[in-house]
């Protein structure tokens, strides 16, 4: 079903530069490049390069898309969970009775028992399941440092509710750094926000596993609905594979233009607005590294005999299970331009104009 | 250069129920389907299944993916920044000296000048610079609210640094509020982290635009550096273009599968594990709806005669700007998945499994 | 074809005025902004005045400011100096000139014939 | 305003040499500088414009570089028809200035 062309690269080049005319345009919204007519001579205003660099600044701070999911994320994540030690247990007794804290304990040896070595960890969750709550209370919950010391992990705002709801944390990190470490247990905090103005703040909320009076020793635990660690990671069996040569590589700039890749990958092209386009009309920049994916993405039929060997080209060639696999963009970045409208100077910044990687989808 | 050919659909679905049965081996690294030999009579176990639909129920709170963009975020946004109110303003009066806190004002007529509707506004970061810190320091961003009551927003745990460097927060919600309402100034407030416990948190970071006294009234303002807000926004004379009948759609399951579109879109295909791919040994769930998509995504040539009307067809068709556009999956969701291995029962997650949206890429 | 003809020049007296026409063709006009450009006999070049593309924004070099003033009809496709106050160091050839203001770099991308102008008594 | 100093006023090459005019600003002014050139009796003509770019249509043994307030204009192999005047001019801001120009004549 698949028909091979020699590939026509200058040909694909002029129809992405072409692609690209009608692209910015289109998200200009205007029907034809603006008149430079009524624009003052000599450089823009200092605010509206300022104004452009800030920008700027922000593209380079952070990419528009995700970056590429790590070859780990493709395969399938072994799911077990590990419940909070149960509140009889004395290391509770450490921890003063408050009111605006409850405490959950973890053996760390449960948790080793799952996920053996750090580096098979792909996404911990600590899970809660909150009773009803009468009024908003913003909580914090903190991870267990040295003795008694806290470190503050992430925050959430709870919304007043009459039924029970499952609340979920990200602790991947802290799980991670549990496993490299010799702790035989581990805790969370889970405190009421405490401003630096206000700090009579109760702890409202009712986690299913503490009583309202919030001693850990006095819960009555509901069965398995007591907190618990939801851990996702790749089984050591399965682990050895990933260091091995047939790993998924990142379709990126840094391996893509290194590289004699013919399969699908990220293609370097640099866009000069004047030479490339005849724009004369946008400032600022004078041109930007558009680049663009191709090379192809082979269908590969599971049915084939030498079925082991076929099943490791999935994570390349065809991760998406397509009928017809595509070599698409994957990080895409924006682009901020100045340009005059009349006599004045617009900075607009442009989404996903730049490619940084591409797959095969 | 593009060769219409008749899809016959019932080969592309054969395709991509073949492509799942490798993609589902790939993803378990496993080179056939695993023997069911030692496998108990009855059903799951409790705890198995309790993991399963602990599983499902992360999969129900959170995609994969990000949703698909919504039609405003394909056009360009105008950058516009609006500075702090200079500290010698009487509202820095109202707030009290503090070790624990800074306030910064804008003026809301300069937000509304730069961004007439709240609807418009794709993003505003509150931008601050940072001056050289010796001390890691939690901070905690606030809104004004009322009178004199704050809003807690965000929180940053700051690394010491010798040199200055720009902070910004998200605070896109909080304008569109200001944009909404009628007062006249609004307000932030940056302070310490104060746990419950350790209250006599002192704000370290020094944040140009204020005196290291920190009385806004006293602050020396280093040029253009002092805080501002950068705002990213739709322009009102291009907005009206939004509610248009050519808008973009979100080529997901709710539009896709209702309607007849011939191009680009989500199709719908239910796998039957036992009848699509003759395997027994998945034991949860039956099957699932995989989907996938099809449909063309036409090249647009910009130098078309009917130039604005090819212009509008970008965002839809190859608003990539692509050589070669493709129907390629946008939102993706995972799939858990119990099966045994030997007499053990196993909860995997598989990635990217369920197409609900698809793309022109 | 892209050209531009200028008109009007002339010999007149000192403290005289005159008014110099540039007609263009062969390019959309009011997109554009224009400009005079002007050479004294056996000297150098000297810009006089600009204006753009609407019409909306003149700029004058400090010898002619408040003697000369810059139009334009777009309808018609023209552009005008008015010259009042006239003075013999005037003299030169003007040239009319479209400007390329893209990026505010503002060069002279087409240029007239030039039209000489004598101020003497 | 900005006073913009063309050296040499005058220069006697010959056909094939290379050729170099340079232009100095009173003030920064990069990239806002254009060059052009002038014949007897005839109007100036575009060669370069923002420092270094080549206007369409004229010949690649002309290019501009330069940077701040110092510009030059380089021929790389002189032709016959290339013996003119040559003036810089700025755009940096109003009053747009020219430099005085070079002319170049024939050894």
């Known amino acids: 079903l698949s028909t091979c062309k020699t590939i026509d690269m200058e040909l694909v080049k002029r129809k992405r530069i072409e692609a690209i005319r009608g692209q910015i345009l289109s998200k200009l919204r205007l029907a034809s490049p603006p008149s430079q007519g009524e624009v003052p001579p000599g450089p823009l205003p200092e605010a509206v390069l300022a104004l452009y660099n800030s920008t700027r600044d922000r593209v380079a701070g952070e990419s528009a898309e995700p970056e590429p999911e790590p070859e780990a994320d493709y395969y399938a994540k072994e799911v077990t969970r590990v419940l909070m030690v149960e509140t009889h247990n004395e290391i509770y007794d450490k921890f003063k009775q408050s009111t605006h804290s409850i405490y959950m304990f973890f053996n760390t040896s449960e948790l080793r028992e799952a996920v053996p070595e750090p580096v098979l960890l792909s996404r911990a969750e600590l899970r809660l399941l909150r009773l009803k709550l009468k009024v908003e209370q913003h909580v914090e919950l903190y991870q267990k440092y040295s003795n008694n010391s806290w470190r503050y992990l992430s925050n959430r705002l709870l919304a007043p509710s009459d039924s029970p709801e499952w609340l979920s944390f990200d602790v991947t990190g802290v799980v991670r750094q549990w496993l490299s470490r010799g702790g035989e247990i581990e805790g969370f905090r889970l405190s009421a926000h405490c401003s630096c103005d206000s700090r009579d703040n109760t702890l409202q909320v009712d986690i299913n596993g503490f009583t309202t009076g919030r001693r850990g020793d006095l819960a009555t635990i509901h069965g398995m609905n007591r907190p618990f660690l939801l851990l996702m990671a790749t089984p050591l069996e399965r682990a050895q594979h990933l260091q091995s040569s047939r790993h998924r590589r990142a379709l990126d700039t840094n391996y893509c233009f290194s590289s004699t890749e013919k399969n699908c990958c990220v293609r370097q092209l640099y866009i000069d607005f004047r030479k490339d386009l005849g724009w004369k009309w946008i400032h600022e920049p004078k041109g930007y590294h558009a680049n663009f994916c191709l090379g192809p993405c082979p269908y590969i039929w599971s049915l084939d005999t030498q079925y082991s060997k076929v099943l490791a080209l999935y994570n390349q060639h065809n991760p998406g299970a397509s009928a017809a696999p595509c070599c698409v963009p994957q990080a895409l970045e924006p682009l901020p331009i100045v340009y005059y409208v009349g006599r004045k100077p617009k900075v607009e910044q442009l989404s996903n104009m730049i490619v940084r990687s591409c797959k095969c989808s | 250069l593009s060769t219409c050919k008749t899809i016959d659909m019932e080969l592309v679905k054969r395709k991509r129920i073949e492509a799942i049965r490798g993609q589902i081996l790939s993803k378990l690294r496993l080179a056939s389907p695993p023997s069911q030999g030692e496998v108990p009579p009855g059903p799951l176990p409790e705890a198995v299944l309790a993991l399963y639909n602990s599983t499902r129920d992360r999969v129900a709170g959170e995609s994969a993916e990000p949703e698909p963009e919504p039609e405003a975020d394909y056009y360009a946004k105008e950058v516009t920044r609006v500075l702090m109110v200079e500290t010698h303003n009487e509202i820095y009066d109202k707030f009290k000296q503090s070790t624990h806190s800074i306030y910064m004002f804008f003026n809301t007529s300069e937000l509304r000048e730069a961004v007439p509707e709240p609807v418009l506004l794709s993003r505003a970061e509150l931008r601050l610079l940072r001056l050289k810190l010796k001390v890691e320091q939690h901070v905690e961003l606030y809104q004004k609210y009322s009178n004199n009551s704050w809003r807690y927003l965000s929180n940053r745990l700051l690394a010491p640094s010798d040199s200055p460097e720009w902070l910004s927060f998200d605070v896109t919600g909080v304008v569109r509020q200001w944009l909404s309402r009628g007062g006249e100034i609004e307000g932030f407030r940056l302070s310490a982290h104060c746990s419950c416990d350790s209250r006599d948190n002192t704000l370290q970071v020094d944040i140009n635009g204020f005196t290291t006294g920190r009385r806004g009234d006293l602050a020396t303002i280093h040029g253009m550096n002092r805080p501002f807000l950068l705002l990213m926004a739709t322009p009102l004379e291009r907005a009206q273009h939004l509610q248009s009948s050519r808008h973009r759609r979100a080529l997901d399951t709710n539009y896709c599968f209702s309607s007849t579109e011939k191009n680009c879109c989500v199709r719908q295909l239910y796998i039957d594990f036992r009848k699509d791919l003759g395997w027994k040994w998945i034991h949860e769930p039956k099957g699932y709806h995989a989907n996938f998509c099809l449909g063309p995504c036409p090249y647009i040539w910009s130098l078309d005669t009917q130039y604005s009307k090819v212009l509008a067809l970008y965002n839809q068709h190859n608003p990539g700007a692509s050589a070669a556009p493709c129907c390629v999956p946008q939102a993706l969701e995972p799939l858990p998945i119990v099966y045994y291995v030997g007499r053990k029962p196993k909860v995997e997650q598989l990635s990217n499994m369920i197409v609900r949206s698809c793309k022109c890429s | 074809e892209v050209q531009l003809l200028e008109s009007g020049g002339g010999l007149v007296q000192p403290g005289g005025s005159l008014r110099l026409s540039c007609a263009a063709s062969?390019?959309?006009?009011?997109?554009?902004?224009m400009s005079w450009v002007r050479q004294a006999p056996g000297k150098g070049l000297e810009w006089v005045s600009a204006?753009?593309?609407?019409?909306?924004?003149?700029y004058y070099a400090d010898s002619v400011k408040g003697r000369f003033t810059i139009s334009r009809d777009n309808s018609k496709n023209t552009l005008y100096l008015q010259m009042n106050s006239l003075r013999a160091e005037d003299t030169a050839v003007y040239y009319c000139?479209?400007?390329?203001?893209?990026?505010?770099?503002?060069?002279?991308?087409?240029w007239g014939r030039g039209t000489l102008v004598t101020v003497s008594s | 305003d900005i006073q913009m100093t063309q050296s040499p006023s005058s220069l006697s090459a010959s056909v094939g040499d290379r050729v170099t005019i340079t232009c100095r600003a009173s003030?920064?002014?990069?990239?806002?500088l254009n060059w052009y050139q002038q014949k007897p009796g005839k109007a100036p003509k575009l060669l370069i414009y923002?420092?270094?770019e080549l206007e369409s249509g004229v010949p690649s043994r002309f290019s501009g570089s330069g940077s701040g307030t110092d510009f030059t204009l380089t021929i790389s192999s002189l032709q016959p028809e290339d013996f003119a005047t040559y003036y810089c001019?700025?755009?940096?801001?109003?009053?747009?200035?020219f430099g005085g120009g070079t002319k170049l004549e024939i050894k």
């Open positions: 923002a420092a270094s």
């Open positions: 001019q700025q755009s940096y801001s109003t009053p747009l200035t």
């Open positions: 062969g390019f959309t006009f009011s997109s554009y902004a």
């Open positions: 204006i753009s593309g609407s019409g909306g924004s003149t």
């Open positions: 000139a479209r400007v390329d203001s893209s990026g505010g770099y503002w060069y002279f991308d087409l």
């Open positions: 003030q920064f002014i990069s990239p806002y």
